[in-house]
């Protein structure tokens, strides 16, 4: 009775992992493991208090993970990187907005390369590989008082526990600091066979 | 022994729905609830018969939900808003295309701000919050007879039953009315723990 | 008997594919079928060794499916098309990057239409329908030595076994051949009720 009730509460309609539990009948064990191994996800929004100043490609290390729309579960955010805790196939995405208003000052150059790179780093093999890139060259002339441009990228990738996802952009000082503007995330879709 | 071992190896952590049924054996109950609680989704395509004029930001209220690529299940479309019926984490997306041909007449201004905002409204707290935004400032000069621009945004959000998703755009009269061009949607990825 | 029949009809191919197996105890049968019917996906990256020339709209037929980030499971890649093997609702996406450097020579025109079209073809009814489109008109002037632009589209669609997904672009000779730049993919989210 109590065990079944607890199971219904925890398992709910989660996508649960049958494995051992179904075979040997240890339902409580299943329930506990189901809770622990729920599908990982993250939605991280830009923390604009610490954005680099250059116009070159830089790794963005300051992201919120627990305020506003930002959230994380069964993944870890550390040192500016999103760390995978559970092997699987994930859908990764990023939305990056750049903006300039004439009140912010004169642009050093009107010809801009506004880019995003979503990269994967493996601790075992300490090298970084770009999974997705996007962006545009833009001519932001002084004829207009306001300029804006957004990039969206997304793709489906196999990620292993311990691998790290990070985001690099050019012209970081042009980033739009709103949580609805500049963010990236991931959610697990399925296990690796 | 051997059968169980093989099962553990093959089934692994497949995503299944155990719920109450597996515990107390009420399979028909599982079946019914499974049908009722199938993962919600929606893909709504623009209904161009009723697009507002002007260049200001407006909420788009006319969308198809049941013709062509448009479809909806376990969500509701009402009063121009996509209503959540089932708590969960959803992937939301929008694709918005703007276009202008010189045969449509002269633009009021050649400097345009082409934007999309995907917003969430809670009936309990009647305020609107932008989940995602994207777009670009564009210079659509008279030197070219045709202009086109598309925006794509996507992200992973926690939605509660009763919350409403809507789409706002600037320059709605420039929207491309094709179903493959201007649409938004959502699909549930997982339950809330 | 009747209960089992009703169960098979309602649950259909829901996430658990329990059906006969769970009812009559044939666990090994379930395990085998579960393995075979794991959620399909594909992530295909551009094979730039065979990109068409010209500026017109062309179907891209050369994609990698098994090197680098490219992968496929329970779907088929054949004759430049991604073939659906399992009915379901899928999230489809594409990321297309265009670029030009002055060292590549002069562009035939500085006014470009950079577009992507993701299309569905049904073998039963041999006609092609565009599911998603995106892009932009661009003015790539000789004042800048380098130009870049990326498009991202994504959406949720019902696909039947045997249907084919393909990608068309304008100005294929401007495509960025990197695997992180030009790709498309799909993953199954849920069964058809």
């Amino acid at each position: 009775g109590a065990v079944q009730k607890e199971l219904q509460h925890i398992v709910g309609s989660q996508h649960i992992r049958a494995e051992k539990a179904m075979v040997d009948g240890s339902w409580l064990d299943l329930a506990k493991r189901s809770k622990l191994e729920a599908q990982p996800f993250a939605h991280l929004t830009i923390n604009a208090t610490d954005i680099p100043t250059g116009s070159h490609k830089v790794s963005l290390s300051s992201w919120y993970h627990d305020r506003g729309w930002a959230k994380i579960s069964n993944m870890t955010f550390s040192n500016g990187k999103l760390i995978v805790n559970q092997d699987g196939f994930y859908y990764l995405y990023a939305n990056i907005c750049f903006r300039h208003h004439e009140t912010s000052g004169d642009l050093a150059t009107e010809y801009l390369q506004l880019m995003v790179y979503v990269t994967k780093t493996s601790i075992k093999i300490p090298s970084s590989h770009t999974l997705m890139k996007g962006g545009s060259t833009k001519y932001w002339s002084g004829n207009s008082e306001f300029h804006f441009y957004s990039i969206n990228v997304g793709g489906f990738f196999k990620l292993r526990s311990g691998e790290e996802i990070s985001v690099e952009v050019s012209n970081p000082s042009l980033l739009d600091p709103d949580q609805d503007a500049t963010y990236f995330g991931a959610f697990k879709v399925r296990d690796i066979d | 022994g051997a059968v169980q071992k093989e099962l553990q190896h093959i089934v692994g952590s497949q995503h299944i729905r155990a719920e109450k049924a597996m515990v107390d054996g009420s399979w028909l109950d599982l079946a019914k609830r499974s049908k009722l609680e199938a993962q919600p989704f929606a893909h709504l395509t623009i209904n161009a018969t009723d697009i507002p004029t002007g260049s200001h930001k407006v909420s788009l209220s006319s969308w198809y939900h049941d013709r062509g690529w448009a479809k909806i299940s376990n969500m509701t479309f009402s009063n121009g808003k996509l209503i959540v019926n089932q708590d969960g984490f959803y992937y939301l997306y929008a694709n918005i295309c703007f276009r202008h041909h010189e045969t449509s007449g002269d633009l009021a201004t050649e400097y345009l701000q082409l934007m999309v905002y995907v917003t969430k409204t809670s009936i309990k707290i009647p305020s609107s919050h932008t989940l995602m935004k994207g777009g670009s400032t564009k210079y659509w000069s008279g030197n070219s007879e045709f202009h086109f621009y598309s925006i794509n945004v996507g992200g992973f959000f926690k939605l509660r039953s009763g919350e409403e998703i809507s789409v706002e755009v600037s320059n709605p009269s420039l929207l491309d009315p094709d179903q493959d061009a201007t649409y938004f949607g959502a699909f549930k990825v997982r339950d809330i723990d | 008997g009747a209960v089992q029949k009703e169960l098979q009809h309602i649950v259909g191919s829901q996430h658990i594919r329990a059906e006969k197996a769970m009812v009559d105890g044939s666990w090994l049968d379930l395990a085998k079928r579960s393995k075979l019917e794991a959620q399909p996906f594909a992530h295909l990256t551009i094979n730039a060794t065979d990109i068409p020339t010209g500026s017109h709209k062309v179907s891209l037929s050369s994609w990698y499916h098994d090197r680098g980030w490219a992968k496929i499971s329970n779907m088929t890649f054949s004759n430049g098309k991604l073939i659906v093997n399992q009915d379901g609702f899928y999230y489809l996406y594409a990321n297309i990057c265009f670029r030009h450097h002055e060292t590549s020579g002069d562009l035939a025109t500085e006014y470009l239409q950079l577009m992507v079209y993701v299309t569905k073809t049904s073998i039963k009814i041999p006609s092609s329908h565009t599911l998603m489109k995106g892009g932009s008109t661009k003015y790539w002037s000789g004042n800048s030595e380098f130009h870049f632009y990326s498009i991202n589209v994504g959406g949720f669609f019902k696909l039947r076994s045997g249907e084919e997904i393909s990608v068309e672009v304008s100005n294929p000779s401007l495509l960025d051949p990197d695997q992180d730049a030009t790709y498309f993919g799909a993953f199954k989210v849920r069964d058809i009720d």
Epitope: T53, G54, S55, V58, G105, D106, A108, T109 | - | -
Partner: antibody, heavy 121, light 107 residues
Framework: QVQLVESGGGVVQPGRSLRLSCAAS????????MHWVRQAPGKGLEWVAV????????YYADSVKGRFTISRDNSKNTLYLQMNSLRAEDTAVYYC????????WGYGMDGWGQGTTVTVS | DIQMTQSPSTLSASVGDRVTITCRAS??????LAWYQQKPGKAPKLLIY???SLESGVPSRFSGSGSGTEFTLTISSLQPDDFATYYC?????????FGQGTKVEIK
């Protein structure tokens, strides 16, 4: 740690040319605009020229316009100042300086070299 | 070109004193003003940018204020290391100019 090392200074006759170099390290050189600033003996600082991070935009003080040319080679992390038609009033210590912001002008110069002396006589 | 006028040219003060240096622009420069410190035989060092933003690593006793045409640099409690020459520098419309400098010396 930003490091800027100027070289190429020396004694030169009026009307002749000189080319100054500034070797940069400790930061991503290609991401920042760079200035040349000079200081005549016992005098204050005088701005000379600036170049954007990509080399596309260059601006000069009126006093050197048409005679001096600023350039950069991002692959070599080096800034240059080509000085032609030198005059006695160009005698100064020449500093290269890094822009605080790579994207915007006006944020100040947050890294300076130790300077190289140019004497025109 | 915009002219920058600093005052005073020389300032005599003691350790612990509160010191204020003024910089006036010949026309409005919004907040596009920086302050530098230079010691004899050394390169200048950035203290303040955008009129009031403290450069990383600079002691908090330094502060800047003002906008438009009137700007001030304040040292709240003068330290032995602060005896030097201070320059303001403006940016406007792709042109940079420095003030003539203010020498802060020991009283």
């Amino acid at each position: 740690q930003v490091q800027l090392v100027e070289s190429g200074g020396g004694v030169v006759q009026p009307g002749r040319s000189l080319r100054l170099s500034c070797a940069a390290s400790g930061f991503t050189f290609g991401g920042y605009g760079m200035h040349w600033v000079r200081q005549a003996p016992g005098k204050g600082l005088e701005w000379v020229a600036v170049i954007s991070y990509d080399g596309n935009n260059k601006y000069y003080a009126d006093s050197v316009k048409g005679r001096f040319t600023i350039s950069r080679d991002n692959s070599k992390n080096t800034l240059y100042l080509q000085m032609n038609s030198l005059r006695a009033e160009d005698t100064a210590v020449y500093y290269c300086a890094k822009c605080l912001s790579g994207t915007y002008w006006g944020y100040g110069m947050d890294g300076w070299g130790q300077g190289t002396t140019v004497t025109v006589s | 070109d915009i002219q920058m006028t600093q005052s005073p040219s020389t300032l005599s003060a003691s350790v612990g004193d509160r010191v204020t240096i003024t910089c006036r622009a010949s026309q409005s420069i919004s907040n596009w003003l920086a302050w530098y410190q230079q010691k004899p035989g050394k390169a200048p060092k950035l203290l303040i940018y955008k009129a009031s933003s403290l450069e990383s690593g600079v002691p908090s006793r330094f502060s800047g204020s003002g906008s438009g045409t009137e700007f001030t640099l304040t040292i709240s409690s003068l330290q032995p290391d602060d005896f030097a020459t201070y320059y303001c520098q403006q940016y406007n419309n792709y042109s940079w100019t420095f003030g003539q400098g203010t020498k802060v010396e020991i009283k």
